[in-house]
């Protein structure tokens, strides 16, 4: 998957809302530093971004795979082995709205806690209306079948 020329959508995960958009004077800069915005805080920020960025990457992968003009290139990349084999299945399960309940109540919570957390977050964002309309469209059109098959066929140890 290329990371170039891909517009970011709904990915910002703000760790702090203290800074104004405009450039502050040095006094405000000192205040910000006293609050702590250095490497340890940045590391925490990156931790919070990691799972969300992966979902965003998956969404962009799905969007590009649905682009007919790019399908030939996609197949070539599959043949080259440079396209992660689990992306398609992961995305369909990750984003399948009708699958959330099963994940939360069934073995999903027990065996796949990280994935459940992400799916639950997607559900929350749907509930409060903060998730993109585009994702709604994708969710409505994705089936859970492939993801179920993938869960059954994939050993937990292979994914951890």
């Amino acid at each position: 998957r290329s990371l170039q020329d891909t517009e970011e959508k709904s990915r910002s995960f703000s760790a702090s809302q203290a800074d104004p958009l405009s450039d502050p004077d040095q006094m405000n800069e000192d205040k910000r530093h006293s609050q702590g915005t250095f490497t340890s805080d940045y590391s925490k920020y990156l931790d919070s971004r990691r799972a969300q960025d992966f979902v965003q990457w998956l969404m962009n992968t799905k969007r590009n795979r649905n682009n007919i003009a790019k399908r030939h290139d996609e197949f070539e990349r599959h043949a080259e082995g440079t396209f992660t084999s689990d992306v398609s299945s992961y995305l369909e399960g990750q984003a399948a709205k009708e699958f959330i309940a099963w994940l939360v109540k069934g073995r999903g919570r027990r065996d796949f806690p990280e994935e459940v957390a992400i799916v639950e977050e997607l559900g929350r964002r749907h509930a409060d209306g903060s998730f993109s309309d585009e994702m709604n469209t994708i969710l409505d059109n994705l089936a859970a079948r492939d993801f179920i098959n993938w869960l059954i066929q994939t050993k937990i140890t292979d994914r951890k």
Epitope: Q4, D5, S12, R32, Q56, R159
Partner: antibody
Framework: QVQLVESGGGVVQPGRSLRLSCAAS????????MHWVRQAPVKGLEWVAF????????YYVDSVKGRFTISRDNSKNTLFLQMNSLTAEDTAVYYC????????????WGQGTLVTVSS | DIVMTQSPDSLAVSLGERATINCKSS????????????LAWYQQKPRQPPKLLIY???NRESGVPDRFSGSGSGTDFTLTISSLQAEDVAVYYC????????FGQGTKLEIK
């Protein structure tokens, strides 16, 4: 075509200030985090500062804390780095870099602007 | 911070031959939730900025020739150029983006 063009570098005396700019084009500037990365002959590549897409989050390497300020003007597609109390250790080529979808990964870099701190 | 160490510091390879550059991180950059290694490789030619080649340890960036490949997991990684071309002469850097970004010291690749 993504383009990042830095300006504002030059020779400056220790203790003085300098303001770097980075003009961005070819992508939707307001939807990406941006970084400053510097390259000194002795220290190699070193990440300096990050600003989130809307400017709400800013982070700095410890060595520039309290001296450097990163900011952006999304209406003008421009990134800034205000550098105060400069020392010889700040001498480097300063690159502005666009963040990819993945945090802290740099998919485009500017050509860089040289900052020399010398008396 | 995570310390990145590359080897060798410099490398001379004949045209058409394989070039291998190693990178070691002081701690794991593997994110278990998605099984991705947060390791990137950049190429920097003289008087040019770095260019992204590989991300997630093995994913080639768009437009990068398929002679470039990345491998490894956890703390040990390798960049391989399967058949060296004249235009591949450059300094190559690894970078971890799991935590606060840090770079290796660089490996200078030359033609033998």
């Amino acid at each position: 075509q993504v383009q990042l063009v830095e300006s504002g570098g030059g020779v400056v005396q220790p203790g003085r200030s300098l303001r770097l700019s980075c003009a961005a084009s070819g992508f939707t500037f307001r939807t990406y985090g941006m970084h400053w990365v510097r390259q000194a002959p002795v220290k190699g590549l070193e990440w300096v500062a990050f600003i989130s897409k809307d400017g709400s989050d800013k982070y700095y390497v410890d060595s520039v804390k309290g001296r450097f300020t990163i900011s952006r003007d999304n209406s003008k597609n421009t990134l800034f780095l205000q550098m105060n109390s400069l020392t010889a250790e700040d001498t480097a080529v300063y690159y502005c870099a666009k963040e990819s979808i993945l945090a802290a990964l740099f998919d485009y870099w500017g050509q860089g602007t040289l900052v020399t701190v010398s008396s | 911070d995570i310390v990145m160490t590359q080897s060798p510091d410099s490398l001379a390879v004949s045209l058409g031959e394989r070039a291998t550059i190693n990178c070691k991180s002081s701690q794991s950059v593997l994110y278990s939730s998605n099984n991705k290694n947060y390791l990137a490789w950049y190429q920097q030619k003289p008087r040019q900025p770095p260019k992204l080649l590989i991300y997630w340890a093995s994913n080639r960036e768009s437009g990068v020739p398929d002679r470039f490949s990345g491998s490894g997991s956890g703390t040990d990684f390798t960049l391989t150029i399967s058949s060296l071309q004249a235009e591949d002469v450059a300094v190559y850097y690894c970078q971890q983006f799991y935590s606060v970004p840090t770079f290796g010291q660089g490996t200078k690749l030359e033609i033998k």
